[in-house]
């Protein structure tokens, strides 16, 4: 099992303890209760663009 704080997921993905792997945050709008989606809320997805400097 992954130790928290090690092998972080790439931007736009989040760790799923249910699947033992990084999962794409893009699926969270369709199914927001997936366990990894909590981690997605903490960081913007890769495609997110800041609207301010």
């Amino acid at each position: 099992e992954r130790v928290p704080g090690t092998t972080p997921c790439s931007r736009g993905s989040s760790w799923s303890a249910d699947l033992d792997k990084c999962m794409d945050c893009a699926s969270c709008p369709a199914r927001p209760h997936s366990d990894f989606c909590l981690g997605c809320a903490a960081a913007p997805p890769a495609s997110f663009r800041l609207l301010w400097p």
Epitope: E1, A17, D18, L19, D20, K21, A30, R31, S34
Partner: antibody, heavy 120, light 108 residues
Framework: EVQLLESGGGLVQPGGSLRLSCAAS????????MMWVRQAPGKGLEWVSY????????HYADSVKGRFTISRDNSKNTLYLQMNSLRAEDTAVYYC?????????????WGQGTLVTVSS | DIQMTQSPATLSASVGDRVTITCRAS??????LNWYQQKPGKAPKLLIY???SLQSGVPSRFSGSGSGTDFTLTISSLQPEDFATYYC??????????FGPGTKVEIK
């Protein structure tokens, strides 16, 4: 060829215990989530329990929570279901099934099932 | 919990018929819907996943459609080996997976 072979079913009295096993072969067991699903005689399918690939995360249907424990031994390619405090309503064929490679989405391979009968 | 219903409960059909089975969810489940076939005394077999994707090895006469709350499984030309019970299953609320009650396809 992917194969899942359940064993351990049988007749048990109410309040008794059983441990089911599911031996996996024909694929690399450790990366896959696994599930138990049951089917009472003449009835439909009911999801029972889920375990993550590492075994670190488990989930249970409300009907078995606190009585059943799912576990796995990846070195033996085997899935288990420890069933305690059995009730008549637990009588069913119990199937182990392999989860899909995304988020719990489907069950792509199933065992042949093992019958558990709870009766005095 | 998300409830799944199927209609009809039993369907009588002949070889060669086009058969449609409906599955309805009590709330929107996007496309997180799968279909299984089960023959007496056998384990269920995955036919369709993600509402419309055909599982490897499943004949192309089987197809699935729908999203949200309403889904259909269609068998374009019923074959003798297709007489069985069909179940839908939602995986939207995973791990609280639920199955429909089943539709039995029998010989007319």
């Amino acid at each position: 060829e992917v194969q899942l072979l359940e064993s351990g079913g049988g007749l048990v009295q109410p309040g008794g215990s059983l441990r089911l096993s599911c031996a996996a072969s024909g694929f690399t067991f450790s990366p896959y989530p696994m599930m138990w699903v049951r089917q009472a005689p003449g009835k439909g399918l009911e999801w029972v329990s889920y375990i993550s690939p590492s075994g670190g995360k488990t989930h249970y249907a409300d009907s078995v929570k606190g009585r059943f424990t799912i576990s796995r031994d990846n070195s033996k390619n085997t899935l288990y279901l420890q069933m305690n405090s059995l009730r008549a309503e637990d009588t069913a064929v119990y199937y182990c099934a392999r989860g899909g490679d995304t988020y719990f989405d489907y069950f792509d391979y199933w065992g042949q099932g093992t019958l558990v009968t709870v009766s005095s | 919990d998300i409830q799944m219903t199927q209609s009809p409960a039993t369907l009588s059909a002949s070889v060669g018929d086009r058969v449609t089975i409906t599955c309805r969810a009590s709330q929107s489940i996007s496309s997180y819907l799968n279909w299984y076939q089960q023959k007496p005394g056998k384990a269920p077999k995955l036919l369709i996943y993600a509402a419309s994707s055909l599982q490897s090895g499943v004949p192309s006469r089987f197809s699935g459609s729908g999203s949200g709350t309403d889904f259909t499984l269609t068998i374009s030309s019923l074959q003798p080996e297709d007489f069985a019970t069909y179940y839908c299953q939602q995986s939207y609320s995973s791990p609280g997976i639920t199955f429909g009650p089943g539709t039995k396809v029998e010989i007319k």
